[in-house]
């Protein structure tokens, strides 16, 4: 059995502040089980911008429905984009564990924001 | 507001431990990595330990094995476990944000260290 | 480990001038390096990064420059709560995260 890919699509997206960010994520295969995270950076200091499994993010939405077993598109949505939220996002699988550990990486989404149009 | 508050420091021998708190509100703790920065009396500052939101820590040499970074996700407080402390450890212990950026962007006021036979 | 070395030591400078300092690094940092500034019994406070991004909130007095291992910070016009010790720290992706030994900008 092929091993899991985590595909981010889009090398880069640019949006207008105010507007929402649609950052585009799919994995090839339901094994091995655990979640997907996002987050803005690659280092140890990353921050982190979505968690399938708990915490607290108001402005990202799924667009899909993330909780199905079957699902494999984790593609997010961050609403009222501001200039502060430039950069680059990573889409993560991890490997159900205590605690969860990292499987794969996406290559990155680089969300860049225009000026809010006149 | 962003607000961190050391506590935990004090005065003790070389190679005895103590642990330092710091309690963070204003931001979704969870989210990010959070470190200790610290300053000996009159000296610059040296970064001392990181920890990222996954829990994966990082130290400085000059605290390896003997230091221990952790964080209660539930309780929003980091906390620095240090054993066998050394005179050259006397320093203003702060904790700090870290953003994606690997820039330290909230600082607290800081707790003083004092290791003295 | 990425050493930082800043210049001068001590800046005297009078209210209303131009200050400006510099930090070398002893290899490659790009971009990746930020200012902060302290002030006596307080705690760092960011002020640049990037090379040249201010913070929030920071006075548009405050620019850095410099990519590389030569990098810049100027103080357009000095006011009085801006005497204070400066570090500058790189900030590529992995730790361990160093700090320059700083430069006190005190009072002509």
């Known amino acids: 059995e092929e091993e899991l890919q985590v595909i981010q699509p889009d090398k880069s997206v640019s949006v207008a502040a105010g507007e929402s960010a649609i950052l585009h994520c799919t994995v090839t295969s339901l094994i091995p089980v655990g979640p997907i995270q996002w987050f803005r950076g690659a280092g140890p200091a990353r921050e982190l911008i979505y968690n399938q499994k708990e915490g607290h993010f108001p402005r990202v939405t799924t667009v899909s429905e993330s909780t199905k077993r079957e699902n494999m598109d984790f593609s997010i949505s961050i609403s009222n984009i501001t200039p502060a939220d430039a950069g680059t996002y990573y889409c993560v699988k991890f490997r159900k564990g205590s605690p969860d550990t990292e499987f794969k990486s996406g290559a990155g989404t680089e969300l860049s924001v225009r000026a809010k149009p006149s | 507001d962003v607000q961190l508050v050391e506590s935990g420091g004090g005065l003790v021998r070389p190679g005895e431990s103590l642990r330092l708190s710091c309690a963070a509100s204003?931001?979704?703790?969870?989210?990010?990595?959070v470190t200790w920065v610290r300053q000996a009396p009159g000296e610059g500052l040296e970064w001392v330990s990181l920890?990222?939101?996954?829990?994966?820590?990082y130290y400085a040499d000059s605290v390896k094995g003997r230091f221990t970074i952790s964080r209660d996700n539930s309780k929003s407080t980091l906390y620095l476990q240090m054993n066998g402390l050394r005179a050259e450890d006397t320093a203003v212990y702060y904790c700090?944000?870290?953003?994606?950026?690997?820039?330290?962007?909230?600082w607290g006021l800081g707790t003083l260290v004092t290791v003295s036979s | 480990e990425i050493v930082l070395t800043q210049s001068p030591g001590t800046l005297s400078v009078s209210p209303g001038e131009r200050a400006t300092f510099s930090c070398r690094a002893s290899?490659?940092?790009?971009?990746?390096l930020a200012w902060y500034q302290q002030k006596p019994g307080q705690a760092p406070r960011l002020l640049i990064y990037?090379?040249?991004t201010r913070a929030t909130g920071i006075p548009a007095r405050f620019s850095g420059s410099g990519s590389g291992t030569e990098f810049t910070l100027t103080i357009s016009s000095l006011q009085s709560e801006d005497f204070a010790v400066y570090y500058c720290?790189?900030?590529?992706?992995?730790?361990?995260?160093?700090f320059g030994g700083g430069t006190k900008v005190e009072i002509k």
């Open positions: 700090a944000k870290v953003t994606w950026k690997n820039v330290f962007d909230y």
């Open positions: 290899q490659t940092v790009g971009s990746k």
């Open positions: 920890i990222s939101v996954t829990g994966t820590t």
């Open positions: 990037d090379a040249n």
């Open positions: 720290q790189q900030h590529t992706d992995w730790p361990p995260y160093t």
């Open positions: 204003g931001f979704t703790f969870t989210n990010y990595a």
